[in-house]
Amino acid sequence: SNNKRAPYWTNTEKMEKRLHAVPAANTVKFRCPAGGNPMPTMRWLKNGKEFKQEHRIGGYKVRNQHWSLIMESVVPSDKGNYTCVVENEYGSINHTYHLDVVERSPHRPILQAGLPANASTVVGGDVEFVCKVYSDAQPHIQWIKHVEKNGSKYGPDGLPYLKVLKAAGVNTTDKEIEVLYIRNVTFEDAGEYTCLAGNSIGISFHSAWLTVLPAPGREKEITASPDYLE
């Protein structure tokens, strides 16, 4: 099209996580998806200076079609600020990521004590469960509901019936997955909810219970307000 346009970000969700704490020897990928007309170019800076291939052993890869910078097998000297500069003749935009290369021993995910917490609400109400996860490696997080099938919580093998309600995916940010919202609660929503976090070392999970109470009856509301009676 002939509509000239300065560069702009096309997927800010993929750029929300600015601080990347990555274990040594792992691969790091920074993305700055952008658009513009004419199509902008992208370059990368490390600590405010031009980032050259010879600045790191093994160099790095730039995938222009994915607007990404990839560094394999990171080492402590890779720590620092990485800035993508996206520009065309009508303007320039930039975004900075901070990379920390972690050398401590990676461990199972740690879930904050007391979370998620037991909750109760009335039918029609809203509730949220929160799960705070600490992990050296990027954890995969799931919210699971223990469900019943044919009136039973357990299958013929003695294992519980489970339903994955929410899982971290490509389009899910860390903040989004840490909270499970249940809107317009029904009696069927009552039960056990589990926040599960796993990484390459292992899996950890905490559970909480949702209690659903009946909403105040319609008759009670009317008798409590005689003004409304004809």
Partner: antibody, heavy 124, light 112 residues
């Protein structure tokens, strides 16, 4: 049946390279972290490396860091260990071990299934 | 790194008698999720290790109930209530809480 089958072992001179493979079957390979563990002749067990289910995270024992590289091909259900700059002390049986899965587990979350092992001898 | 120290080095047991193996970790293996991540394995001659006990005291499927695991955050015990001929081999404890995963030095059990 859940199975892990290692291959690629052999006799090699110090300083040379060797690539081990582990073929997985009977489970959803792409949903599990995978480990390599080794055992020198007549000795105990030593953990070598782990790779996450999608290959994005890798960790190594200090004794092999910078020399060994763990990788996986989920489309082929295969785990690999590229061993460079081999030393006499790397002589061992190398076991492929299933690690933690991605979902809720009812039993152990990994280290339950081991392969039969493949022997690597580093000798001049 | 977490150091796993196993005792005794070897054990000679009469069939039908009990046996006990100890393992101590240099740091607590009690995780924030309330589980204690110590595993026990038996390695029979010429075979890979086989899982006996996971998360301190849970028997793996197919493991006879004569095997039991117990302990606290740093001190763990594997007990065999009545040793049988098929129980011979080397027993290892392992910590599964952080990398590098580490194993005890092993306890060789033989029949008198």
């Amino acid at each position: 049946e859940v199975q892990l089958l290692e291959s690629g072992g052999g006799v090699v001179q110090p300083g040379r390279s060797l690539r081990l493979s582990c073929a997985a079957s009977g489970f959803t390979f792409s949903s599990y972290a995978m480990h390599w563990v080794r055992q020198a002749p007549g000795k105990g067990l030593e953990w070598v490396a782990v790779i996450s289910y999608d290959g994005s995270n890798k960790y190594y024992a200090d004794s092999v860091k910078g020399r060994f590289t763990i990788s996986r091909d989920n489309s082929k259900n295969t785990l690999s260990l590229q061993m460079n700059s081999l030393r006499v002390e790397d002589t061992a049986i190398y076991y492929c071990v299933r690690g933690a899965g991605r979902g809720y587990t009812y039993g152990p979350d990994g280290f339950d299934i081991w392969g039969q092992g493949t022997m690597v001898t580093v000798s001049s | 790194d977490i150091v796993m120290t196993q005792t005794p080095l070897s054990l000679s047991v009469t069939p039908g008698q009990p046996a006990s193996i100890s393992c101590r970790s240099s740091r607590s293996l009690l995780h924030s999720d309330g589980k204690t991540y110590v595993y026990w394995y038996l390695q029979k001659p010429g075979q890979p290790p086989q899982l006996l006990i996971y998360e301190l005291s849970n028997r793996f499927s197919g493991v006879p109930d004569r095997f039991s695991g117990s302990g606290s955050g740093t001190d763990f015990t594997l007990k065999i209530s009545r040793v049988e001929a098929e129980d011979v081999g080397v027993y290892y404890c392992m910590q599964y809480i952080e990398a590098p995963l580490t194993f005890g030095g092993g306890t060789k059990v033989e029949i008198k």
